[in-house]
């Protein structure tokens, strides 16, 4: 089941998955001036068996101006530097989730890959939050969020993290202000409204990926 919701937004924090559950998709996105090769994969898919998980399919980009396909090579240093600018200021290693069964590691870059990586998470995926540079964490619990299925709808658990500016006066534990609900964020951890939604069960996803779903979303 794909997670049909946005992970929680924590002010002054970013998040990252340390590893990706089987079923996760990563779009094959190319940087400006490049496009996917005509016969190329639309996405990479984390698949596996009981002992090993890996990314199926390979992403390949070619210049928008030519018809030549490009080979998969390690990006040039400036390309690696460009990608690194999106990463967090200090490493986060709460757990070596990549060694867990049923998880894939971060896939290696491909030539002319876009600087943005677009993942489609599945139920059970965990992401870890960290305050951005210049802010420090006030923890009330785990700084992580998990995509869960509740009453037939997916939702992300709320990470217990507040990021405060270094110069701000910190509050004593237990006196932290409750996290404001972001605009538009449904706030319901326990209640279950029985309503008709446009959420569609997305079974046998991998089998149908290459067909009609890429113009309309999982019809």
């Amino acid at each position: 089941e794909l997670c049909d919701d946005d992970p929680p937004e924590i002010p002054h924090a970013t998040f990252k998955a340390m590893a990706y559950k089987e079923g996760t998709m990563l779009n094959c996105e190319c940087k400006r001036g490049f496009r996917r090769i005509k016969s190329g994969s639309l996405y990479m898919l984390c698949t596996g068996n009981s002992s090993h998980s890996s990314w199926d399919n390979q992403c390949q980009c070619t210049s928008s101006a030519t018809r030549n396909t490009t080979k998969q090579v390690t990006p040039q240093p400036e390309e690696q530097k460009e990608r690194k600018t999106t990463e967090m200021q200090s490493p986060m290693q709460p757990v070596d989730q990549a060694s867990l069964p049923g998880h894939c590691r971060e896939p290696p870059p491909w030539e002319n890959e876009a600087t943005e990586r677009i993942y489609h998470f599945v139920v059970g995926q965990m992401v870890y939050y960290q305050c951005v540079q210049g802010y420090r964490a006030l923890h009330r619990g785990p700084a992580e969020s998990v995509c869960k299925m509740t009453h037939g709808k997916t939702r992300w658990t709320q990470p217990q993290l507040i990021c405060t500016g270094e110069m701000e006066t910190s509050q004593f534990p237990g006196e932290e202000k409750p996290q404001a609900s972001p605009e538009g964020r449904p706030e319901s951890e326990t209640s279950c409204l029985v309503t008709t939604t446009d959420f569609q069960i997305q079974t046998e996803m991998a089998a149908t990926m290459e067909t009609s779903i890429f113009t309309t979303e999982y019809q």
Partner: nanobody, 130 residues
């Protein structure tokens, strides 16, 4: 990789309503992208109107349109909407739909600067007369 086509523009009296639509096509998942609306009046810079995150959880609006405009999306139809209520003459502009992606494995859920948007539609004219 993503083509965006706006529709629903036209003329409306001040105080009236208009609903703009933006349909995406291309071999990609619509829910890959956050979506935004921008507008450009004659002789002015293109300005942010509002945006919505991948699954519609988060929205953000420019101050001049807050409480009047509403953005929504239907991922099953690969379409994002801009509902314009209580329109004013200063809302007259060409309205553009745009798509943005997220950086790395991290999410800045709603983006407000036009430089952060990767794909753009051709625009649709909205004229509000007094």
């Amino acid at each position: 990789q993503v083509q965006l086509v706006e529709s629903g523009g036209g003329s409306v009296q001040a105080g009236g309503s208009l609903r703009l639509s933006c349909e995406a096509s291309g071999r990609t998942l619509f829910s890959s992208y956050g979506m935004g609306w921008f507008r450009q009046a004659p002789g002015k810079e293109r300005e942010f109107v509002g945006a919505i995150s991948r699954f519609g959880t988060y929205t953000s609006y420019a101050d001049p349109v807050k409480d009047r405009f509403t953005i929504s999306r239907d991922n099953a139809k690969s379409t994002v909407y801009l509902q314009m209520n209580n329109t004013k003459p200063e809302d007259t502009a060409v309205y553009y739909c745009a798509a943005y992606t997220y950086s790395g494995s991290f999410y800045s859920t709603v983006k407000t600067h036009h430089d952060e948007y990767r794909y753009w539609g051709q625009g649709t004219q909205v004229t509000v007369s007094s």
